[in-house]
Interface confidence: medium
């Protein structure tokens, strides 16, 4: 069957080395386990995390997302997953995009992280 | 800069496995999709399937029977078998690289031209 | 699976003018997951628009991609003698991954 993927609609904010939930849902919900459903980096699709049969597909991340990503997979039985980024870098800021794979049918979500520096700050007056 | 080689037998008979393989120089295997497309002379591009740096594969249907593809992360290579070959699998064999989402392939091998021929 | 048919099979051009290549598709396809790509004699396919609409890294400005649903355009606003080559189109919204029967693009 058909579906829409929704992601969050306005930017994401995150302060460099803290942790950022990127959330992002099939309409209308449904049972995701046996789909896959990954994130990746527009344009040529970089691997950010990759659940598939059944698991989540760590080697086949992209190295600088290695070991900072987590799938947060409570949900998933009514089509909701969220990526959680560890240790969020000033090279996480950008586009991000969200996919559900069903068989041959595949649907997508963008969004966007908007990272900033806790340091930075602007003296009064 | 990352580059795609790649090698293996240009000359089978009926009935033989076809095995080519793809080496990923100057990157790594993790991130992508690394893909095998054929095309016949004078024909057009036809996707067989490809393979992440974990084993995981996508295999198009109309190949599905007949094709094995395996990776060998120590050797930063991807490989292709083609199990009962016939004339029709006469055709030039590219390694390529895609992404995961929008699946364009950026990076190609520089093709091996296999012919079927009893 | 999506059949895409590119058309016509052979365009005839002359150096400086324009061309314009088609890819029907049998079925929608978002123009997120539709390719270009250019292939000359004795050589791999090289990616030249990816979206529908953006060029690849590289890809001179001349070059542009548009259409949406199941109609998509190539257009060489002024062709060069190394633009003389056959042209692709890839589509990912439905596996397999399909290509095109191909454009070639001939100096008149």
């Known amino acids: 069957g058909q579906f829409r993927v929704i992601g969050p609609r306005h930017p994401i904010r995150a302060l460099v080395g803290d942790e950022v939930e990127l959330p992002c849902r099939i309409s209308p919900g449904k049972n995701a386990t046996g789909m896959e459903v990954g994130w990746y980096r527009p344009p040529f699709s970089r691997v950010v995390h990759l659940y598939r049969n059944g698991k989540d597909q760590d080697g086949d991340q992209a190295p600088e997302y290695r070991g900072r990503t987590e799938l947060l997979k409570d949900a998933i039985g009514e089509g909701k997953v969220t990526l959680r980024i560890r240790n969020v870098r000033f090279s996480d800021e950008g586009g991000f995009t969200c996919f559900f794979r069903d068989h041959s049918y595949q649907e997508e979500a963008a969004m966007e992280l908007k990272v900033e520096d806790p340091f930075y700050w602007v003296s009064p007056g | 800069q990352v580059q795609l080689q790649q090698w293996g037998a240009g000359l089978l008979k009926p009935s033989e496995t076809l095995s080519l393989t793809c080496a990923v120089y100057?990157?790594?295997?993790?991130?992508?999709?690394w893909s095998w497309i054929r095309q016949p002379p004078g024909k057009g591009l036809e996707w067989i399937g490809d393979?992440?740096?974990?084993?995981?594969?996508n295999y198009n249907p109309s190949l599905k029977s007949r094709v094995t593809m395996s990776v060998d992360t120590s050797k930063n290579q991807f490989s292709l078998n083609l199990n009962s070959v016939t004339a029709a699998d006469t055709a030039v064999y590219y390694c390529?690289?895609?992404?995961?989402?929008?699946?364009?392939?950026?990076?190609w091998g520089q093709g091996t031209l296999v012919t079927v021929s009893s | 699976e999506i059949v895409l048919t590119q058309s016509p099979a052979t365009l005839s051009l002359s150096p400086g003018e324009r061309a314009t290549l088609s890819c029907r598709a049998s079925?929608?396809?978002?123009?997120?997951?539709l390719a270009w790509y250019q292939q000359k004699p004795g050589q791999a396919p090289r990616l030249l628009i990816y979206g529908a609409s953006s060029r690849a890294t590289g890809i001179p400005d001349r070059f542009s991609g548009s259409g949406s649903g199941t109609d998509f355009t190539l257009t060489i606003s002024r062709l060069e003698p190394e633009d003389f080559a056959v042209y692709y189109c890839q589509q990912r919204s439905n596996w397999p991954l399909t290509f095109g029967g191909g454009t070639k693009v001939e100096i008149k």
């Open positions: 393979i992440t740096h974990s084993g995981s594969t």
């Open positions: 390529a690289r895609r992404g995961i989402g929008a699946a364009v392939f950026d990076l």
């Open positions: 079925q929608s396809v978002s123009s997120s997951y």
């Open positions: 100057g990157g790594s295997l993790s991130g992508y999709y």
